[in-house]
């Protein structure tokens, strides 16, 4: 039975040209995290494998940095980066947990963080 929940940074906004940290946290389970995949609308951004470390997708290597922790840092943001991001936690023995973050990249200097929320 999957008892865990994923807490994410929720709906967030950032300025064009700036950077943002995408962060998820798995709680309420003793399951072992074997791998975390980061996706942007079905496109792979990065993989963090518990044994092998980080793999950044070639097309994002210049703008994506691993960490902090299992999170991901997006740099040199453009308005095209606006959209949904998913952290996919592969765990044993529970299976897969998915968290969703919506990022809005703003032209203006008004970029405030949204509230945290949980996905069971």
């Amino acid at each position: 039975m999957m008892t865990g929940t994923i807490e994410t940074t929720g709906n967030i906004s950032a300025e064009k040209g700036g950077s943002i940290i995408l962060q998820c946290h798995l709680s309420s389970t003793t399951a072992q995290v074997t791998q975390v995949n980061w996706e942007q609308q079905d496109q792979l951004l990065a993989i963090c494998n518990a044994d092998l470390g980080w793999h950044i997708s070639p097309s994002f290597k210049d703008r994506v940095a691993p960490g902090p922790g299992l999170g991901l840092t997006l740099q040199s943001l453009t308005v095209n980066d606006t959209g949904e991001y998913f952290c996919i936690y592969h765990t044993y023995p529970d299976g897969t947990y998915t968290g969703r973050i919506f990022l809005e990249v703003l032209e203006s200097s008004v970029a405030e963080h949204g509230a945290r929320f949980q996905i069971p």
């Epitope: 470390g53 980080w54 793999h55 997708s57 070639p58 290597k61 940095a65």
Partner: antibody, heavy 120, light 112 residues
């Protein structure tokens, strides 16, 4: 030990397609990338693309987009490359290679190669 | 795409003598993560390629220590301190820093 066993030589007609297989053993197929490389006489080595069997993620060299299709069957630990609309220019030896990915980004084990001859 | 240029095209060496192959890239191969993804392969006659060196200077397991890789930025070198008969074949450098991955044209090592 890591082994990549490729399918046998192919003689195919121009305009048709060919599907080459690469059966992996000796490692966890789903957590490493599997790349494909072409070797034409007098043209050296060309990277076609790679696939992450654990999620079906793919990266293609722009030159081979629409020409090559990479797939993987995790149940049999086999990767496939389909090459379409073949011309005499596609006559070559095609290699699969495990790409460690993560913090190395280097193909460490190679299949024996599959010779494809395009001729009418 | 990053162009990898190898010299010489052919290298004719007497067994026991040293050999050196140069590889130059059209762009720096230093990645934003601080690593340089430059690799060397050897393809012996009639065989598939075999990785010798990765990350500029790290030897693959089973590769004799007479092989050394060095360099940074755009200039790299593969050296063999004392060539042996089993070293003959074509040596390729290739880069994994930039997309797509690209290979050098190869250097054929012949035994005199």
């Amino acid at each position: 030990q890591v082994q990549l066993q490729q399918s046998g030589a192919e003689l195919v007609r121009p305009g048709t397609s060919v599907k080459i297989s690469c059966k992996a053993s000796g490692y966890t197929f789903t957590i490493h990338w599997l790349g494909w490389v072409r070797q034409r006489p007098g043209h050296g080595l060309e990277w076609i693309g790679d696939i992450y069997p654990g999620g079906g993620y793919t990266n293609y060299n722009e030159k081979f987009k629409g020409k090559a299709t990479l797939t993987a069957d995790t149940s049999s630990s086999t990767a496939y490359m389909q090459f379409s609309s073949l011309t005499s220019e596609d006559s070559a030896v095609y290699f699969c290679a495990r790409d460690y990915g993560y913090d190395v980004y280097a193909m460490d084990y190679w299949g024996q190669g599959t010779s494809v001859t395009v001729s009418s | 795409d990053v162009v990898m240029t190898q010299t010489p095209l052919t290298l004719s060496v007497t067994i026991g003598q040293p050999a050196s192959i140069s590889c130059k890239s059209s762009q720096s191969l230093l990645d934003s993560d601080g690593k340089t993804y430059l690799n060397w392969l050897l393809q012996r006659p009639g065989q598939s390629p075999k990785r010798l060196i990765y990350l500029v200077s790290k030897l693959d397991s089973g590769v004799p220590d007479r092989f050394t890789g060095s360099g940074s930025g755009t200039d790299f070198t593969l050296k063999i301190s004392r060539v042996e008969a089993e070293d003959l074949g074509v040596y390729y450098c290739w880069q994994g820093t930039h997309f797509p991955r690209t290979f050098g044209g190869g250097t054929k090592l012949e035994i005199k």
